[in-house]
Structures are given as C-alpha cells and as structure tokens.
C-alpha cells in the first residue's frame, strides 16, 4: 500500500473506560493532528477506517462492526461501544484515506473494572473547590454526546461508597452537585451514575472525580518570607559552612506559579563564581497553601563572601517580595594568653 502519514501511538490520549458501559471515542486525528474536521474530510471524499491491535498482540485487525446489537459501531468520527467488554482493551487506529492521501494515528484504550465503591485503576480528574467560599458546583463529567437532549437521564451521586442524601452541605441537583460551603471534610472521590434509555435498552455511565478543597482567593495574600528575617544573624568565620534557609509561605492560588530564588550581590547564583549550592523542598497544607524552602549553602565561606548581600526573593500571582539575610563575619574570641594578659598590663 502507498505511504501513510503515521502519527504513531498517541499515549497522551490514554483513554480509560469502565467495563459494561457505553463509550464514545473520537478519532484523535481531527482533534490534535489535522487542520480540518471530519465533515470537511468526508466532503472531500476521504474515508475513515478503524482497526485495532488487541492487548498483548502485534497483529492489527479490522474492528468487527457486525456484532449482535451493534455492540461496536462507527458514527462519523466516533467509535461507539454499547457497551464495552474487558477484552476490548488494546490500541485502536483511525486512518483517514483516499487514493492519494493517507493519515493515521493510534491510541490506547483500557477497559477497567470498578469495585462496589467505584474504586478502579482509572486516573481521576481533580476538581478544586475553595474553602468556605459560598455555593460551588461540580458537574458530572464526560457525558455529552451519549444521549440526545430530549432524553432525561436519572442521576445518582455518591461520595466514596455512600449515596449522597441528607448531607448537610452537599446537594445533588441532577447533573450537578452543589457544595453550599466547602469544608476540608468534603475532600474525597465523588461519583455520578447516569442511567438513560436507548433503543429499548438501558445504559449506565459511571464518572468519578476527586474533590480537593483548597485555600480561598478571599484569603490569599502575597508571599510571606518567614526566613531570612531581622531576628537571625548568620555570623560565620572564614572556612566555616554558611547555610541560609529561605522559607516562604504561598497562599493557594489557582494556576499561580510560585517562585523562590536567591540573589547574591544582585545576581543569580549561576551567574557568579562562588561555589554555592541551593536545595529546595516544598510542603503543602491541607488546603494546598505551599511552603517552599530554598537553602543556600557555601561549604567554605571566605571573608569576601561574608561581605556580600544575600537576598531571598519570592513571587506569586499575588505579588513579589524580597528579604535580605543578615550575614556578618564573626569577630574571633580573644585568646587568653595573649589578648587577655595584655589587657591586664602583663609584660
């Protein structure tokens, strides 16, 4: 066969679906690789062909679209499973072609099993709610396109194993779940089970997401430098190790990049000749406020190094701050036999 533009295996699209549930999978060609959509391609006389390689096999084979009850079907650029089976797991390829053009991409599909509490190997999306922020909602994800708007599905929401009912601050409202006042105790996995009829059959969709309650923007402040501060002086003799921690607290801010860096005499450590190392550690509070510590270390400090300016800088979406460390050379303690004796006028 003639050459085909092969985009390879698109592992960025690791699709996971639950066993025995419907799944609709769009050909990734039109979403990520080509500059035209399916309708345009179809109008231009291009045909979309599907095939697959089952798990632990090398042989590409056509997809059987003649299964009972049309269990697997194709509709435009969507591959439908009604429903999936465990052994549908494998790498699927969609190929767009005519006599002069060919382009294809493969993607992995994993059919996973869930237990009675909806636990599974499924990678869960995370939805962040602001703590004590007023009413916030989550929506049952990835159910668009499964049934027409004329069909009204039934939805049941669970937190972990338990159906959400008579919860103080969590109210199911169809496809939405409302949190009146989000609290740390609302952290957890939430599952919506959507039941809908189609062509004389009943199908179920199960969608689980993780809710993480985070710091509210109402309470967010610019970075706070706890160290260095005015109370601690780093007094060293030449030859000793100089260690200065820069500890900065960052309020949680959605999509904010938190940065901490040192300057030495106004320059980044990489831009000067001193043998300096910087080690960073990060910790988070329960509401994802962040504390970053960068320890500046000079193994054998010189008297020149002790005269330099060491400044810790921090930046977030809320602002930028800086604090200089108090560094000085230790005055050597007097040696008794010489300095002290001289002081007493000994000859």
């Amino acid at each position: 066969s003639e050459r085909c533009d092969d985009w390879g295996l698109d592992t960025m699209r690791q699709i996971q679906v639950f066993e025995d549930e419907p799944a609709r999978i769009k050909c990734p060609l039109f979403e990520h690789f080509l500059k035209f959509n399916y309708s345009t391609a179809h109008s231009a006389g291009l045909t979309l062909i599907w095939y697959w390689t089952r798990q632990d096999r090398d042989l590409e084979e056509p997809i059987n679209f003649r299964l009972p009850e049309n269990r697997i079907s194709k509709e435009k650029d969507v591959l439908w499973f009604r429903p999936t089976l465990l052994n549908d797991t494998g790498n699927y390829t969609c190929m767009l072609r005519n006599t002069t053009y060919c382009s294809k991409v493969a993607f992995p599909l994993e059919v996973v099993q869930k237990d009675s509490c909806f636990n599974s190997p499924m990678k869960l999306p995370v939805h962040k709610l602001y703590i004590e922020y007023g009413i916030q909602r989550i929506t049952c994800p990835n159910v668009d396109g499964y049934f027409p708007s004329s069909v009204k599905p039934t939805i049941t929401w669970y937190m972990g194993c338990y159906k959400i009912q008579n919860f103080n601050n969590v109210i199911p409202e169809g496809m939405n779940l409302s949190f009146l006042i989000a609290l740390i105790s609302n952290n957890g996995n939430y599952t919506c089970v959507v039941t809908y009829p189609e062509n004389g059959r009943t199908f179920h969709l199960t969608r689980t997401l993780t809710v993480k309650v985070v710091g509210s923007p109402k309470n967010a402040v610019p970075p706070v430098i706890h160290s260095p501060n005015d109370h601690v002086v780093y007094e060293k003799e030449p030859g000793e190790e100089l260690l200065i921690p820069c500890t900065v607290y960052f309020s949680f801010l959605m999509d904010s990049r938190n940065e901490v860096w040192w300057t030495i005499d106004g320059k980044k450590p990489d831009d000067i000749t001193i043998d300096v190392t910087i080690n960073e550690s990060i910790s988070h509070s329960r509401t994802e406020d962040e504390t970053r510590t960068q320890i500046l270390s000079i193994k054998k400090v010189t008297s020149e190094d002790l005269k330099r300016s060491y400044v810790c800088h921090a930046r977030s979406a809320k602002g930028e701050v800086a604090k200089a460390a108090k560094v000085k050379q230790k005055v050597p303690a007097p040696r008794y036999t010489v300095e002290l004796a001289c002081g007493f006028g000994a000859t």
């Epitope: 639950f18 039934t154 009912q165």
Partner: antibody
Framework: QVQLQQSGAELARPGASVKFSCKAS????????MQWVKQRPGQGLEWIGT????????RYTQKFKGKATLTADKSSSTAYMQLSGLASEDSAVYYC????????????WGAGTTVTVSS | DIKMTQSPSSMYASLGERVTITCKAS??????LSWFLQKPGKSPKTLIY???RLVDGVPSRFSGGGSGQDYSLTISSLEYEDLGIYYC?????????FGSGTKLEIK
C-alpha cells in the same frame, strides 16, 4: 439478552442448610449487583440482601444476617445464596434479580427457587 | 428501617378504566422508588424506577410520579394483562423495603 437462571426446587429438613444458585448470562456479571428477595406463599416480597460480584461486597437486612449468606463465583457468572438453620418459616420462593448502582437497582428477575422445609 | 405503606391492599377495576395505586414512605426517600407487577405463579417484573422512569419495554399506559414520602403508579387505561399484584420498593437506603402489595382484579 440478559437472563438469570435459578436452580431447581429444594426440599430440606429443619435445622439443615441449603445452597441454591442464580446463573447470569447476557451481561458482565461483575459489573452489576445481585439482589435476593424472599416470598412466602401468599405473602409479599421481602428484601434479603445484595452482593456485588466484582469484589464480593454484601449488604443484608438485619433479619437475615446469620441466616443467609450471599456469595458469587466470577468464573461461572453464578451467584449463590445459602440458608442455614432452616425452619418452617424459611419455606418460600427465593428470587435473584440484577440491579445497577443508584438508579435501577432491580431490572431483570430470575424465575425463583422454591425451598420447602419439612420434617 | 423505612416502612412503605401501600394502598389500597386490593381493588377491582374495569377494563379501560384509569387506575391509581399509592405508596407512602415513613420518611423522605428522594424518588428512589420502583414499582413491580407480579402475576400469579410468576416472578415480579420491574415497571418503573426512580419514581417516574419507565423500564424499557413497559407499555406507556403505565406512569409513576411523586416525591418526598408520597408516590403513585397510574395505569391510564386498564388492560387484562395488567391484572396481578403491584409492589412498590424504596431503595433510598439499606435495608431496601417493599410495600405490602396491591391486588388488582377485574370488576
């Protein structure tokens, strides 16, 4: 299509145990709950309990704890109910029924197994 | 446990007549209610789930409704095959509980 095939009638002595089955076909056995229901002659329906074959998790009504034991064999897609310490009031038809999470907890029913306890 | 009170316990109706059966829960069951029909010597058949959703294949003359503690099943025009015993079931919380049944007979 979805079918639940229940085992045949059982005759047992008081104090004995019986174990009967419900074989599922036409769907993924491990993805649905299996409900069990009791019906005494001329009486109404009484929920006994449920099992999720995917992980063996069970729930029982208080009255049947210690009386009924629900199990499932994934390899044969079969659910079982064992009744122990049989007494005359255990004489009944026992139904299995398939159900999903949340919305549709009973959809397809088995034909029932008749248990008669007699000395 | 949630108690389900079904009424009437039995009723007579003519073919073509509109029939309504009710079920009252001892507490709010949040529309987690199903209706079943059992014909003599047969296993029950599920008609309705989540209070008002018709199971696939069930004739459209059956409808369900209600919320909170009060629910109903209506047959818009009674047919001979609709005769039997109707049960409601709450599945809002464990243990699930059935109503005591309504026997529907021909007048």
């Amino acid at each position: 299509q979805v079918q639940l095939q229940q085992s045949g009638a059982e005759l047992a002595r008081p104090g004995a145990s019986v174990k009967f089955s419900c074989k599922a076909s036409g769907y993924t056995f491990t993805s649905y709950w299996m409900q069990w229901v009791k019906q005494r002659p001329g009486q109404g329906l009484e929920w006994i309990g449920t099992i999720y074959p995917g992980d063996g998790n069970t729930r029982y009504t208080q009255k049947f704890k210690g009386k009924a034991t629900l199990t499932a064999d994934k390899s044969s897609s079969t659910a079982y109910m064992q009744l122990s310490g049989l007494a005359s009031e255990d004489s009944a038809v026992y139904y299995c029924a398939r159900g999903y999470f949340g919305n549709l907890v009973f959809d397809v029913w088995g034909a029932g197994t008749t248990v008669t306890v007699s000395s | 446990d949630i108690k389900m009170t079904q009424s009437p316990s039995s009723m007579y109706a003519s073919l073509g007549e509109r029939v309504t059966i009710t079920c009252k829960a001892s507490q709010d069951i949040n529309t987690y209610l199903s209706w079943f029909l059992q014909k003599p010597g047969k296993s029950p058949k599920t008609l309705i789930y989540r209070a008002d959703r018709l199971v696939d294949g069930v004739p459209s003359r059956f409808s369900g409704g209600g919320s909170g503690q009060d629910y109903s099943l209506t047959i818009s025009s009674l047919e001979y095959e609709d005769l039997g015993i109707y049960y409601c079931l709450q599945y809002d919380e464990f243990p699930y509980t059935f109503g005591s049944g309504t026997k529907l007979e021909i007048k």
